[in-house]
Amino acid sequence: SSPTSSASSFSSSAPFLASAVSAQPPLPDQCPALCECSEAARTVKCVNRNLTEVPTDLPAYVRNLFLTGNQLAVLPAGAFARRPPLAELAALNLSGSRLDEVRAGAFEHLPSLRQLDLSHNPLADLSPFAFSGSNASVSAPSPLVELILNHIVPPEDERQNRSFEGMVVAALLAGRALQGLRRLELASNHFLYLPRDVLAQLPSLRHLDLSNNSLVSLTYVSFRNLTHLESLHLEDNALKVLHNGTLAELQGLPHIRVFLDNNPWVCDCHMADMVTWLKETEVVQGKDRLTCAYPEKMRNRVLLELNSADLDCDPILPPSLQTS
């Protein structure tokens, strides 16, 4: 979200000054070409300017940096490393800037960086060390508290010959750098599965958004260690049923609110436990909106209104009784 300061409080830099100044050490109150700056709000906006690289002459006071709607393509190592360092930079928004590669150490030398938004970039190549900065098995802790990675899946023809889920998870887990992460948004990424180790290594999570993916099952995912988790968004996935183990883990989390709208629930005999749970649990938000998608005879039935007699499975006939 953009800062509340009025546009008139931002000073704009004339484009023709850019080449003359970029080689010099930045002046304390200088504003990069094609950007708007407010020292009072500690904010720099370089928005929808088709920039192809991060400005070198960012003012040292910057706390909130918006580089959205550009054409950055690649974020190299030390993309924000400056002398003196951008020691105050706390919120960095790079959404919608056509990034397809983020290299190892891209966010190094940003000691105060708490919020990072890379949403709406087709990240075909996200280095495992993009957030940790090094390939050590245990890196220095990242200051990141909020990481927004919504809709970073590249078009299918641009994906590397590897699992996109695996690439993202490798970056989240490298060097255990993100142990302090409290908010993680991974919505709209076509995730088919959630690697089982990812949540166990992000113990500080308060908010996890996995909405609008293609998750079919949570059977191998454990939420048990996420004792601080406050919201879990699983809307608009491909979930068919939640099994007892998952129900028990969710029920036991002390702060949790779970969002399950718009999943294609399969209302057969395997749904009985979930329906029983839904009728009593208070952790599912808007549970009265959950409806069956399959089988056809159950479509649009409200889960809370089902009873055990409704939830049957067609018997599997022995081969000798099956008709051709």
């Epitope: 406050e230 029920q251 749970w277 208070e282 938000q285």
Partner: antibody, heavy 122, light 111 residues
């Protein structure tokens, strides 16, 4: 810092009405279930009821002893919780506490106000 | 309604010594693997404060001399070494079913 401050208590005659208020601060009010608990002088605690959060439609549950007489409501714009008490009886005399439920409401109340005294007497 | 029975009604304690309070439920307060049983302390002239939730989880900021145990219908609150500031009335509460109910309370006082 989470804070809950009750007000509106006082002396009321049997059959009368009273409206208690609870001003909440320090948390996202709409995310949480809120409740009223009362304590008659020298007695134990009695759950009066709760009101659910935004995600669960702000619906309410009341104890049998107050059903049809007491109504729990909330004004989310003001981060305030209310207890409208009608047809009051002598046995409703108590300190009334406003309390916030934990994020998972099954774990009950984690923050309580200081209480407001309601005395029903002629 | 689920009835909670606390014992003892009154518990005289010596500072530095351990203390234990029992709470028994008329039916199980377990739901999908968690016992939804809380313990509160109400100090004289104050509001109740949460000590233990989910039978055994110590609330943040509560001294680690407090612990909770039990499952299903039988629960115990233990204070490993009682301090003078621990005096007051202790209540158990179940939130497994509506209506939520409280035990009658146990008054802990210094001998």
């Amino acid at each position: 810092e989470v804070q809950l401050v009750e007000s509106g208590g006082g002396l009321v005659q049997p059959g009368g009405s009273l409206r208690l208020s609870c001003a909440a601060s320090g948390f996202t009010f709409t995310d949480y279930y809120m409740s009223w608990v009362r304590q008659a002088p020298g007695k134990g605690l009695e759950w009066v009821g709760f009101i659910r959060n935004k995600g669960n439609g702000y619906t309410t549950e009341n104890s049998a002893s107050v059903k049809g007489r007491f109504t729990i409501s909330r004004d989310n714009a003001k981060s305030s919780l209310y207890l409208q008490m009608n047809s009051l009886r002598a046995e409703d005399t108590a300190v009334y506490y406003c309390a916030r439920y934990r994020g998972n409401p099954h774990y009950a109340m984690d923050y309580w106000g200081q209480g407001t005294l309601v005395t029903v007497s002629s | 309604d689920i009835v909670l029975t606390q014992s003892p009604l009154s518990l005289p304690v010596t500072p530095g010594e351990p203390a234990s309070i029992s709470c028994r439920a008329s039916e199980s307060v377990e739901f999908y693997g968690t016992s939804f049983l809380q313990w509160y302390l109400q100090k004289p002239g104050q509001s109740p404060q949460l000590l233990i939730y989910g039978a055994s989880n110590v609330e943040s900021g509560v001294p680690d001399r407090f612990s909770g145990s039990g499952s299903g219908t039988d629960f115990t609150l233990k204070i490993s070494r009682v301090e003078a500031e621990d005096i007051g009335v202790y209540f158990c509460q179940q939130s497994r079913k509506v209506p939520s109910t409280f035990g009658g309370g146990t008054k802990v006082e210094i001998k």
